[in-house]
């Protein structure tokens, strides 16, 4: 765990004759505040995915009025840093963005007014516990410049804060093995300590005493190899005697969210859904107004001038949540056919065609009936790029591979009766009816519509449909 | 108006080392970055690595890391990029810039270093 | 490294012509891409930086758009001074890479 600290030197006008005007004037005075967002640098996330690492808003800076006539200067900044803190380890090499607001303190109907001046990103290498890191960036007319550096809490050290530091037991040196715990160097480095007989391989631990698994492989120890032919469950921890996953404890187990946050799985961990006022990785940020600009990727925020009032945010196509947090997950609507896997890239939706398919949705079968087998004494029908299998009698589905229910499309009429058989169906007819499928009404007098029945079958008995 | 000037054109056998020099004017020289930028002949832009003139610190591409040392003196306003054990491949015109993360706004008229034995 | 691919790599085209050059970008860059000017045996000029943002001086015929992997650069009426190599340069990861140029020459 650790702690992940953003100090803004300045923020003004770009070098070069054509600076911007101040953002604040005598009518309109206004201060800023700073947001910072987040994320591992190698994930493979669109850009509009949450802040995964996390998420900080500065306080306000001093009111600002421009001075007419006078150039504009480095604005007024808030006071500290921007602190982000991180429950795990830190990924060494992290994505950012940080985003300049603009709060208008004129007479604005319902309060301040928000704007976003500027937004830098970048995505940079850090080791935790080195020096401040320094940067320069240019957005539009403005240049932002600051610094940042991740620093471990204790007991956590090193250059993920994966390592933990413990007071010495001896006051001249560390134990056999240890070093001392720079910068603390009246501490030792705590040996982390897995669970006996954790797989070295394919086992680890970040809390002393336990074994987590890494992926592939199951067990107390993680020493079983995780077969998933015979397995229902999708998730573990797993039965060491069957490699198999058993249900266990999932992301959301006891919901990570607070403050009525609702909790949902994700392939790699949880995500939560903050009710209004809240928002965070585990809606753990409140009293929320306008002012903290908690709309997201260029949510307009409407009413919440005071922290009792709740906000609104208005998300733009394409997000939702209420903080418009979430990308729409299109993918979701699966528009892909035939078992194509759906990418959402961000700014298009891509199909991963299965082989055999191809178009933009995987709508092509590109193998129509070469080499394609229809089960079960069916022939298949080319056409249209595609093909379809003209299934047996009692077979049906894509490859004629299911077993056919004949008396599913309610064939007899007139309230007949229907018999599945091996063969097909019989139809049992209600009386006055005749016929396969008792189309046909018998005549009062006994006579039939139809040609005499066949020998040794009275009209009304069941007639085999051949 | 800001200005960058650099040394003149090198030339240098292989295995040697060459320092260019970059003499900035016209702003105050500690607020931006010293970008290397190398273009060889006839090829695309390279970028080499940077340092920030307050704090010395400087980051290098990681093609160059072991063979490129940039320093500063702040009293003559000049930064210099010594490329060491030079080979043939490192002909090309070696530029400076001043900038940060995100721009590079100004460049020197560039030096062009010949490595030939 | 982040990989830049422009296209074309030449362009032939006449004063007044309205030209576009694009980039992509092999990942996700946000905004943070770059163009720059150069003219045989001369430094590159900053045109346009934070894919939109003009430079102080630079007409304003230039103009830049794109975020994410897909950016271009257009020329809305170009000018004899125009014809040059282009350059874009992403600058969102370090170290910052620069697309492999297009040539405009004249038709």
């Known amino acids: 765990a650790g702690v992940f600290e953003l100090q803004i030197h300045s923020f003004g006008p770009g070098p070069g004759p054509g600076a911007p005007r101040s953002p604040c004037s005598a009518r309109l005075p206004c201060r800023l505040f700073f947001r910072v967002c987040l994320k591992p640098g190698l994930s493979e996330e669109a850009a509009e995915s949450p802040c995964a690492l996390g998420a900080a808003l500065s306080a306000r800076g001093p009111v600002y009025t421009e001075q007419p006539g006078a150039p504009a200067p480095d604005l007024p900044l808030p006071d500290g840093l921007l602190q982000v803190p991180f429950r795990d380890a830190w990924p060494g090499t992290f994505s950012f963005i940080i985003e300049t607001w603009r709060e208008e303190l004129g007479d604005q109907i319902g309060g301040p007014a928000w704007s976003l001046l500027a937004r830098v990103a970048g995505r940079r290498r850090l080791a935790a516990g080195g020096p401040w890191a320094r940067d320069i960036q240019r957005a539009g007319a403005w240049e932002l410049r600051f610094s940042y550096r991740a620093r471990c809490e204790p007991p956590a050290v090193g250059t993920a804060c994966t390592r933990l530091c413990r007071p010495r037991s001896a006051p001249s040196r560390c134990g056999p093995g240890l070093r001392p715990c720079a910068p603390l160097e009246d501490e030792c480095e705590a040996p982390l300590v897995c669970r006996a007989g954790c797989s070295p391989e394919h086992g680890f631990c970040e809390q002393p005493g336990e074994c987590r698994c890494l992926e592939g492989w199951t067990g107390p120890l993680c020493t079983v190899p995780v077969s998933t032919s015979s397995c229902l469950s999708p998730r573990g921890p797993s039965s060491a005697t069957t490699g198999c996953l058993v249900p266990g404890p999932g992301p959301c187990d006891g919901n990570p969210c607070a403050n009525g946050g609702s909790c949902s799985e994700t392939p790699r961990s949880f995500e939560c859904t903050c009710p209004r006022g809240f928002y965070g990785l585990r809606c753990e940020v409140s009293g929320v107004t306008c002012a903290d600009g908690p709309c997201f990727n260029g949510g307009l925020c409407v009413g919440g001038a005071d922290p009792d009032s709740a906000y609104i945010c208005h998300c733009p196509p394409g997000f939702q949540g209420s903080n418009c947090e979430k990308r729409v997950d299109r993918c979701s609507l699966q528009p892909c056919r035939n078992g194509g896997l759906c990418l959402d890239l961000g700014h298009a939706l891509r199909c991963r065609c299965r082989a055999g398919f191809a178009g933009p949705r995987c709508e092509h079968d590109l193998d129509d009936c070469a080499g394609r087998a229809c089960a079960n004494g069916g022939t298949c029908v080319e056409g249209g790029g595609a093909h379809r299998c003209s299934c047996a009698l009692g077979f049906g589905g894509r490859d004629c591979r299911e077993r056919a229910d004949p008396c599913a499309a309610r064939p007899c009429a007139h309230g007949g009766r229907c018999y599945a058989h091996f063969s097909g169906l019989v139809c049992a007819c209600a009386p006055g009816y005749m016929g396969a499928r008792c189309e046909f009404p018998v005549h009062p007098d006994g006579a039939s519509a139809l040609p005499a029945a066949p020998p040794g079958l009275r009209p009304g008995d069941p007639q085999r449909y051949l | 108006q800001v200005q960058l000037v650099q040394s003149g054109a090198e030339v240098k056998k292989p295995g040697a080392s060459v320092k260019v020099s970059c003499k900035a004017s016209?702003?105050?020289?500690?607020?931006?970055?010293i970008h290397w930028i190398r273009q060889a002949p006839g090829q695309g832009l390279e970028w080499m690595g940077y340092i920030n003139p307050t704090t010395v610190y400087t980051e290098f591409n990681q093609n160059f890391k072991d063979r490129v040392t940039m320093t500063r003196d702040t009293s003559t306003s000049t930064v210099y990029m010594e490329l060491s054990s030079l080979r043939s491949e490192d002909t090309a015109v070696y530029y400076c810039a001043r900038g940060g993360s995100n721009f590079f706004d100004h460049w020197g008229q560039g030096t062009t270093v010949t490595v030939s034995s | 490294a982040i990989q830049l691919t422009q296209s074309p790599s030449s362009l032939s085209a006449s004063v007044g012509d309205r030209v576009t050059i694009t980039c992509r970008a092999s990942?996700?860059?946000?905004?943070?891409l770059a163009w720059y000017q150069q003219k045989p045996g001369k430094a590159p000029k900053l045109l346009i930086y934070?894919?939109?943002s003009l430079e102080d001086g630079v007409p304003s015929r230039f103009s830049g758009s794109g975020s994410g992997t897909d950016f271009t650069l257009t020329i809305s009426s170009l000018q004899p001074e125009d014809f040059a190599t282009y350059f874009c340069k992403q600058a969102y990861d370090v170290p910052p890479t620069f697309g492999g140029g297009t040539k405009l020459e004249i038709k």
């Open positions: 934070t894919a939109n």
């Open positions: 990942e996700n860059i946000y905004y943070n």
């Open positions: 016209g702003y105050t020289f500690t607020r931006y970055w």
